[in-house]
Amino acid sequence: AFGISGVPKYTRALHDSSITGISPITESLASLSTYNDQSITFALEDESYEIYVEDLKKDKKKDKVLLSYYESQHPSSESGDGVDGKMLMVTLSPTKDFWLQANNKEHSVELHKCEKPLPDQAFFVLHNRSFNCVSFECKTDPGVFIGVKDNHLALIKVDYSENLGSENILFKLSE
């Protein structure tokens, strides 16, 4: 079940994957939480979507996100991250036809309705981290990651030499 009221839920078929051009290599539904186990939730407010980072009550179901995984031809610098040296990218969709997108000008993460092929702002390079965590780097802005700021998702610039393990850009995926 999804936490967005009045929004179509995913079925087993998930999305129509017959995209022109780039196509995913696998798809699955997962809930997204922070390193500190706060849930990422989505709400429809005034005909637009808001993304929240919050502690969930025990009886409340976590919102699910459709993760579509894509291979990039760019080499992966991290051992174990890619296959045959390919980087992995993901798109994240909490409800049909809406995707998380990076707004680099506003340093924000937003939900937008869009048609395929998806814009580059909807793609994030997937990085495996310790503690069963991952991080999401903007395809359009290397070094900038989805992170948590003031109980919202935001874009956070990370200095590779210092803070790649910074807790505010670490996320957990669970079923």
């Epitope: 087993r12 998930l14 696998t26 539904l29 174990g80 991250d81 296959v83």
Partner: antibody
Framework: EVQLVETGGGLIQPGGSLRLSCAAS????????MSWVRQAPGKGLEWVSA????????YYADSVKGRFTISRDNSKNTLYLQMNSLRAEDTAVYYC????????????????WGQGTLVTVSS | EIVLTQSPGTLSLSPGERATLSCRAS??????LSWYQQKPGQAPRLLIY???HRLTGIPDRFSGSGSGTDFTLTISRLEPEDFAVYYC??????????FGGGTKVEIK
């Protein structure tokens, strides 16, 4: 070199127990979901069980649910399959297999396979 | 449980001919489907993943297509080393995952 080596197979009586191990090397073990797949003599492939990279999620075929338990020790780079209440129809070569991509989730194809270990259940 | 039905069970062809193998799922698996080749006494070998992505190093005579419930593996021109058993495998959510019964491609 990326490698999976299964051990623990053998001849066992019906109702008995056996634990299979799969030692992994050459890759970051915890990044990958793992599965057990079996093949009865002269038959096709049958998926048995899978486990996520963290070990937090486990999945089973209906034919083994309640009898088999999959687990992993990421500190030892080892996958296990505990098989209880064994039946004649469990006789097969058991393969461990690694998913293609390091996404920790099990929803992926299998790229690396072990050589297999034969389990024979017979009185 | 999703059932994968492969057809035909056996395909008798000559080297140089085109092979078309079918895999039908009892319900949609999206693009979460792969194809394997297996020869006697060997472990399976991955050919195609994500329904249509050919693994690096696999000859381009192998191609996969389809999504949802109907999938096809095509071998454009059979080489002597291609005679083997081929399996499709679905890894859709939620499990259990399943394999098809296999198609044997044999020399005519």
């Amino acid at each position: 070199e990326v490698q999976l080596v299964e051990t623990g197979g053998g001849l066992i009586q019906p109702g008995g127990s056996l634990r299979l191990s799969c030692a992994a090397s050459g890759f970051t073990f915890s990044f990958y979901a793992m599965s057990w797949v079996r093949q009865a003599p002269g038959k096709g492939l049958e998926w048995v069980s899978a486990i996520s990279g963290s070990g937090g999620s486990t999945y089973y075929a209906d034919s083994v649910k309640g009898r088999f338990t999959i687990s992993r020790d990421n500190s030892k780079n080892t996958l296990y399959l505990q098989m209880n209440s064994l039946r004649a129809e469990d006789t097969a070569v058991y393969y461990c297999a690694r998913t293609l991509h390091g996404i920790r989730a099990a929803y992926d194809a299998f790229i690396i396979w072990g050589q297999g270990t034969l389990v024979t259940v017979s009185s | 449980e999703i059932v994968l039905t492969q057809s035909p069970g056996t395909l008798s062809l000559s080297p140089g001919e085109r092979a078309t193998l079918s895999c039908r799922a009892s319900q949609s698996v999206g693009i979460n489907l792969s194809w394997y080749q297996q020869k006697p006494g060997q472990a399976p070998r991955l050919l195609i993943y994500g329904a249509s992505h050919r693994l690096t190093g696999i000859p381009d005579r192998f191609s996969g297509s389809g999504s949802g419930t109907d999938f096809t593996l095509t071998i454009s021109r059979l080489e002597p080393e291609d005679f083997a058993v081929y399996y499709c495998h679905q890894y859709s959510q939620p499990p259990p995952f399943t394999f098809g019964g296999g198609t044997k491609v044999e020399i005519k």
